[in-house]
């Protein structure tokens, strides 16, 4: 009876279990009743990082110097290239696809520490009573407007991203 499931590092095809190709190799042809799976090493600047049945290897990532990127770790047939940023610059994401001089803090966050040559911007959430409605690399959270000191009342509560809205007091006639 043909198998319905295969062992680890195997795959099911044409009612039979074939070996997957090892990392660094791609599939050329599936196994048959008489032949093993045929695999071929990935070419220069290509990789596959898992046991697989891929017919094409993936291209190594290109660390584009025009985006401030350089190679941190050269790729192999089993691993992708790892990019990093030029000295003094910071990756915009874990994948490091582009670089910024320093990150900015989003609305709802204020700058706790301005970036230096060695450290990126440090952001902090605006606590209750403070807000930031801009993306900035230098602005701290600002305190909500005090309506009382203007002889006004709060018409709309503030948030971490918006100031309070003040309005006139309702006066009894």
């Amino acid at each position: 009876e043909p198998p319905t499931a295969c062992r680890e590092k195997q795959y099911l095809i044409n009612s039979q279990c074939c070996s997957l190709c090892q990392p660094g190799q791609k599939l050329v042809s599936d196994c048959t009743e008489f032949t093993e799976t045929e695999c071929l090493p990935c070419g220069e600047s290509e990789f596959l990082d898992t046991w697989n049945r891929e017919t094409h290897c993936h291209q190594h990532k290109y660390c584009d110097p025009n985006l401030g990127l350089r190679v941190q770790q050269k790729g192999t047939s089993e691993t992708d290239t790892i990019c990093t940023c030029e000295e003094g610059w910071h990756c915009t994401s874990e994948a490091c696809e582009s670089c910024v001089l320093h990150r900015s803090c989003s609305p709802g966050f204020g700058v706790k520490q301005i970036a230096t040559g060695v450290s990126d911007t440090i952001c902090e959430p605006c606590p209750v009573g403070f807000f930031s409605n801009v993306s900035s690399a230098f602005e701290k959270c600002h305190p909500w407007t005090s309506c009382e000191t203007k002889d006004l009342v709060v018409q709309q509560a503030g948030t971490n991203k918006t100031d309070v809205v003040c309005g006139p007091q309702d006066r009894l006639r």
Epitope: G68, S98, C99, V100, H102, R103, S104, S135, F138, E139
Partner: nanobody, 116 residues
């Protein structure tokens, strides 16, 4: 395409003044926080000064506080840096940059040399 064109650099004696300009195009200038950043020969980038989009709030590095003034004219899409009481240690290439400070969004810079 974002373009930032710095000008106004030159050779000046210690104690002298210069006014740098940065002409911006390719983006809505009035919506962006802007920075002046400098790089002295053989040194890393130093953040000098920043200004919010409306021009109402500013930041200055301790090394330039009281001597430099950042300003902007949103009607002319231009950023300025007025530099007074210049010192030898202010010698650097000065760049203007916009949020989010990506590597490709920089001008060529303008060289300021402070020397007697």
């Amino acid at each position: 395409e974002v373009q930032l064109l710095e000008s106004g650099g030159g050779l000046v004696q210690p104690g002298g003044s210069l006014r740098l300009s940065c002409a911006a195009s390719g983006f809505t200038f009035r919506d962006y926080e802007m920075w002046w950043v400098r790089q002295a020969p053989g040194k890393g980038l130093e953040r000098v000064s920043a200004i919010n989009p409306q021009g109402t709030r500013t930041y200055y590095a301790d090394s330039v506080k009281g001597r430099f003034t950042i300003s902007r004219d949103n009607s002319k899409n231009t950023l300025y840096l007025q530099m007074n009481s210049l010192r030898a240690e202010d010698t650097a290439v000065y760049y203007c940059a916009k949020l989010p400070f990506t590597f490709e969004d920089w001008g060529q810079g303008t060289l300021v040399t402070v020397s007697s």
